[in-house]
């Protein structure tokens, strides 16, 4: 289904076995440290009311939040994966820098705000949960933006 032309990532970004593997390994390691299995950040509530053509823009917001407010504060943990995955995700973020939507993004901002509030409310364990869902972030970015 169509996306804003600037809200697009080349599929080749997701076809690099080494960094894909490292992203999933980082997620797996963090999820082992996540003791709050009742909450899912990247799930139905995040996308509710967001049309297919706006899903990449939403994922851009989630990616930027994850980089700035989750991965950077936790950058000394989960090595060596973290030091390899952060530059990769930063590259994806840069590629989406000109991704905007023309219509009203109020619902998107509401959904992203809810995710941010959940992470903040959980404190450090919220950050660990977000890292543990990097596999879902990766796949959702791919599905929404390619």
């Amino acid at each position: 289904l169509p996306v804003n032309t600037r809200c697009k990532l080349e599929v080749s970004n997701f076809q690099q076995p080494y960094i894909v593997n490292r992203t999933f390994m980082l997620a797996k390691e963090a999820s082992l440290a996540d003791n709050n299995t009742d909450v899912r950040l990247i799930g139905e509530k995040l996308f509710r009311g967001v049309s297919a053509k706006d899903q990449c823009y939403l994922m851009k917001q989630v990616l930027n939040f994850t980089l700035e407010d989750v991965l950077l504060p936790q950058s000394d943990r989960f090595q060596p994966y973290m030091q390899e995955v952060v530059p990769f995700l930063t590259k994806l973020s840069n590629q989406l820098s000109s991704c905007h939507i023309s219509g009203d993004d109020q619902n998107i901002q509401k959904n992203v705000r809810r995710l941010k509030e959940t992470v903040k409310k959980l404190g450090e364990s919220g950050e660990i949960k977000a890292i543990g869902e990097l596999d879902l972030l990766f796949m959702s970015l791919r599905n929404a933006c390619v």
Epitope: L1, P2, V11, F14, I42, G43, E44, F47, R48, G49, V50, S51, A52, K53, Q55, L136, M139, S140, R142, N143, A144, V146
Partner: antibody
Framework: QSVEESGGRLVTPGTPLTLTCTVS????????MIWVRQAPGEGLEWIGI?????STYYASWAKGRFTISRTSTTVDLKITSPTTGDTATYFC?????????????WGPGTLVTVSS | AVVLTQTASPVSAPVGGTVTIKCQAS??????LAWYQQKPGQPPKLLIY???TLASGVPSRFKGSGSGTEFTLTISDLECADAATYYC??????????????FGGGTEVVVK
């Protein structure tokens, strides 16, 4: 949260038929909806989808043969010119995007028989 | 369009036993695979998505695994109520929307 199809009946080839999917417990402004069909004794076949913003997309084989539209609480599937090959149970389902599309819940289906 | 090839029907096992159903995709679909259960006269019911995530209310006896092109649904501690046809379903993104959703041909499970 539930969906239910209606409008299935016996029709003669070439007679247009509209099926209706009525939703309750959720809003069509929050979820896309899909139509899937199943011929007797056969597997599942995706027909098309109507997105939250009203955009419609169809399987390549279904283009021109089906039209999907909606109101605030219903989603219609029009079979423009039925043939005997369109005899099937027609299902509608809610599309929950969770980073990948998943279909849940489904309606019980409505049977369309095309015969002269 | 992606083609999904499932284990041939029927697959049978005794009550308390285990069955394994395979689903092979003709191209890499990452983990964009779901499994549905359909009993005669009923609509499909979502069991698993993201290849391995259990849908709400589905017993842990159902287990999905795999990624890329090879996927498996395993049902352990079989119950009579598990007798049904199981379908895998793929989502393919980035191509034209007219081939986005594909179902496998289905695998019938018989519980003896």
């Amino acid at each position: 949260q539930s969906v239910e199809e209606s409008g299935g009946r016996l029709v003669t080839p070439g007679t247009p038929l509209t099926l209706t999917c009525t939703v309750s417990g959720f809003s069509l402004s929050s979820y896309a909806m899909i139509w899937v069909r199943q011929a007797p004794g056969e597997g599942l076949e995706w027909i098309g989808i109507i997105d939250i913003d009203g955009s419609t997309y169809y399987a390549s084989w279904a283009k021109g043969r089906f039209t999907i539209s909606r109101t605030s609480t219903t989603v219609d599937l029009k079979i423009t010119s039925p043939t005997t090959g369109d005899t099937a149970t027609y299902f509608c389902a809610r599309d929950r995007f969770v980073g990948v599309d998943i279909f849940d819940p489904w309606g019980p289906g409505t049977l369309v028989t095309v015969s002269s | 369009a992606v083609v999904l090839t499932q284990t041939a029907s029927p697959v049978s096992a005794p009550v308390g036993g285990t069955v394994t159903i395979k689903c092979q995709a003709s191209e890499d679909i990452y983990t964009n695979l779901a499994w549905y259960q359909q009993k005669p006269g009923q609509p499909p019911k979502l069991l698993i998505y993201w290849a391995s995530t259990l849908a709400s209310g589905v017993p842990s006896r159902f287990k999905g695994s795999g990624s890329g092109t090879e996927f498996t649904l395993t049902i352990s501690d079989l119950e009579c109520a598990d007798a049904a046809t199981y379908y895998c379903q793929a989502c393919v993104y980035g191509n034209s929307a007219d081939s986005r959703y594909t179902f496998g041909g289905g695998t019938e499970v018989v519980v003896k």
